[in-house]
């Protein structure tokens, strides 16, 4: 079947080595032959020639191919060339000769098996295959092809891509650390309950893709959509030479969805227990699970064991909200987390959604803080607060947000990280109410914002003159 | 199915001409070797001339007897053999086959044939 | 060139009877094939590739032999088998065919 993909090869005599440790040469004839009519013959220098026996099989609308497939290892060398010819026995004639290298023929065999899941990160895939012939793999490269399942579409677009051998997994950066510095205190962090979904579609040629022997990961990919995907090799072309082989037969993958459709968000209040909460759905009951892994170069926990979170009772602590669903977990400050949430539908179907992983330092929730104030002259407020953690004080920014009674819209300010207090000029004679929360977002710390705190109501004083 | 059908047989004088025919049909013809054979009265088969495939560029062979004085052919468009016999001697008086080299058999379909008498 | 014996030239059988037909190569071959040729018709392909009977040959009819010695056998005669067979090689340029073995029945 893989001829075809020898179509390029313009001598009529065809070789291929799947291994480097084997050779199979063919040739067509349009014109039919008794058996015996036809000798493939070969020579490596200065020896003896002998004959590759022959097999041939019919080709419907076009005559014969005899295909010979030598017969021992030994006679298969690399580096020397071997000269070949197909003679008609019966006329003694030569039909066709070439003279080429075993080395510079491969046309590997597909990997083996393949398998597919979901990556760490929402959109990612993780694929890992078995090469037929392990003792080549260090001298093939991989290329892979990839495209949404699609029932309603079978004509969806296709990715190909090459693997690059050479880069390592992606999982080594440290999850969502993004750099603080460049960013005004309190902008919305890029943690995983907030990470808004990827928009790399896989119709363009963007998606990440890396790769380690025998795995290699794609990301920007859609969550929650179908893929199939399929893998094939070539000769590195430095140490071998040869063909693209064929195409691995295509295997299909459901990728969960992004954990951030359902309001995931996961936090610590003591670096030890961690707590995830996610939207319930309605008409549906959902379970959260975790695992914790090591930061290291390829993924070796390619299939992880995925531990039940806890299961904490529903809150609805107001109707306007909706319904949280909740969980814990013991923790551990040397690993990065990994979260999932599996939602069951009434019919039973079971959806999964991946959260994006973090370090438990990136998920430190701080208690409320408590906000004091004084008037010192009318309208003229001096504020003051607690830092919840003097751990991290250098690392927590605030946001502060008042209103004036009546009023729907809230006034949001940022004082500067690290702030202890602040000043606030409100209208004299009017009636606010003012709230405080905390965050960190530092280098050692980020996490998501407390709750605020609750509503401190300020009557400001009768202006005065001095 | 298979047909071979030859004709142009005939009585001819020593060093005289012939050409005989074989319409082909049922097969393509154009990727299959052909080949005149023939049975001289109460004897037994001598093989005399060989054209191979276009593939083959229509090369031509013949048995020793008959070299430099037959010919064969092939018309490629209209699917048929022939077979020119040119300077006739008496020992070329026999029955002529035209036959289809196989895959199986190096001739696996005959026709039924063409009696040639060269006489005086 | 190859040169084929048959033996014997001409021989009768009864029906029931087994019957060989030898064909000798005057250097070795890799295959011999036969034809069958009645009265009057044509020569039909009979076995190829030494033992493989033709569609539509009995299965009475079993080729055997290697290098420069092969033979067509009938395991039990029947009228319908009275013929001429003719072995033929196509191991080297020319063709050659036997001089052929006419078989009647007894």
């Known amino acids: 079947q893989d001829v075809s993909l020898l179509a390029s090869d313009s001598e009529p005599l065809k070789c291929f080595s799947r291994t480097f440790e084997d050779l199979t040469c063919f040739w067509d004839e349009e014109e039919a032959a008794p058996s015996g009519t036809y000798q493939l013959l070969y020579a490596y220098p200065r020896e003896k020639p002998r004959a590759c026996p022959l097999s041939s099989q019919s080709m419907p609308h076009f005559g014969t191919r005899y295909v010979c497939q030598f017969p021992d290892q030994e006679e298969v060398r690399l580096f020397f060339p071997l000269h070949l010819w197909v003679k008609n026995v019966f006329l003694n004639q030569t039909r066709t000769q070439r003279v080429l290298f075993v080395d510079s023929v491969g046309l590997p065999a597909p990997p083996s098996i393949i398998k597919a899941m979901g990556g760490s990160q929402p959109g990612e895939l993780q694929i890992s295959w078995e090469e037929p012939a392990p003792e080549i793999s260090d001298f093939l490269r991989y290329e892979l092809r990839y495209g949404p399942r699609d029932p309603k579409n079978s004509t969806g677009p296709t990715v190909i891509q090459l693997i690059a051998t050479e880069t390592c997994c992606p999982a080594l950066q440290r999850p969502h650390s993004a750099s603080a510095l460049d960013q005004s205190p309190c902008a919305q962090p890029t943690m995983p309950w907030q990470d808004g979904p990827k928009q790399t579609s896989p119709s363009r040629e963007a998606s990440a893709l890396t790769a380690e022997g025998g795995s290699c990961l794609i990301s920007g990919l859609q969550p929650g959509n179908s893929y199939w995907l399929q893998l094939r090799s070539e000769p590195d072309g430095i140490s071998l030479g040869g063909s693209w082989g064929s195409w691995s037969l295509p295997v299909t993958v459901d990728l969960p969805g992004d954990a951030v459709a359902l309001g995931l968000q996961c936090f610590t209040l003591d670096l030890k227990n961690v707590t995830c909460q996610w939207q319930q759905q309605d008409h549906a009951s959902s379970q959260g699970f975790f695992y914790h892994s090591r930061a290291r170069c390829c993924p070796r926990d390619r299939y992880p064991i995925w531990e039940n979170c806890e299961e904490e009772e529903k809150t609805n602590p107001g109707l306007q909200t909706p319904q949280f669903s909740r969980c814990h977990f013991k923790s551990r400050n040397d690993s990065i987390i990994h979260i999932l949430v599996e939602v069951t539908t009434a019919p039973g179907t079971v959806h999964s959604y991946l959260g994006s992983p973090f370090w438990i330092h990136q998920a430190v929730r701080l208690p409320t803080p408590n906000l004091h104030w004084r008037e010192i002259s009318s309208g003229h407020l001096e504020l003051e607060w607690q830092h919840p953690s003097s751990w991290a004080a250098q690392e927590t920014c605030y946001q502060l947000r008042y209103t004036g009674e009546g009023h729907q819209d809230w006034k949001v300010l940022e004082p500067p990280l690290g702030a202890r207090g602040g000043t606030l000029e409100l209208r004299p004679r009017s009636r606010y109410r003012l709230q405080l929360r905390a965050r960190l977002n530092g280098p050692t710390y980020q996490g998501p914002w407390s709750s605020w705190s609750d509503p401190t109501r300020v009557e400001t004083a009768t202006e005065t003159a001095w | 199915e298979v047909q071979l059908v030859e004709s142009g047989g005939g009585l001819v004088q020593p060093k005289g001409s012939l050409k005989l025919s074989c319409a082909a049909s049922g097969f393509s013809f154009n990727t299959y070797a052909m080949n005149w054979v023939r049975q001289a009265p109460g004897k037994g088969l001598e093989w005399i001339a060989h054209i191979r495939s276009k593939s083959n560029n229509f090369a031509t062979y013949y048995a020793d007897s008959v070299k430099d004085r037959f010919s064969i052919s092939r018309d490629a468009s209209e699917n048929i053999l022939f077979l020119q016999m040119n300077n006739l001697k008496t020992e070329d008086t026999a029955m002529y086959y035209c036959?289809?080299?196989?895959?199986?058999?190096?001739?696996?379909?005959w026709g039924q044939g063409t009696s040639v008498t060269v006489s005086s | 060139q190859i040169v084929l014996t048959q033996s014997p030239a001409i021989m009768s059988a009864s029906p029931g009877e087994k019957v060989t037909i030898s064909c000798s190569a005057s250097?070795?071959?890799?295959?011999m094939y036969w034809y069958q040729q009645k009265p009057g018709s044509s020569p039909k392909p009979w076995i190829y590739r030494t033992s493989n009977l033709a569609s539509g040959v009995p299965a009475r009819f079993s080729g055997s032999g290697s290098g420069t010695s092969y033979s067509l056998t009938i395991s039990n005669m029947e009228a319908e088998d009275a013929a001429a067979y003719y072995c033929?090689?196509?191991?080297?340029?020319?063709?050659?065919f036997g001089g052929g073995t006419k078989l009647e029945v007894k």
């Open positions: 033929q090689q196509y191991h080297s340029y020319p063709t050659t």
């Open positions: 036959v289809r080299q196989g895959g199986d058999f190096p001739m696996d379909y």
């Open positions: 250097s070795s071959v890799s295959y």
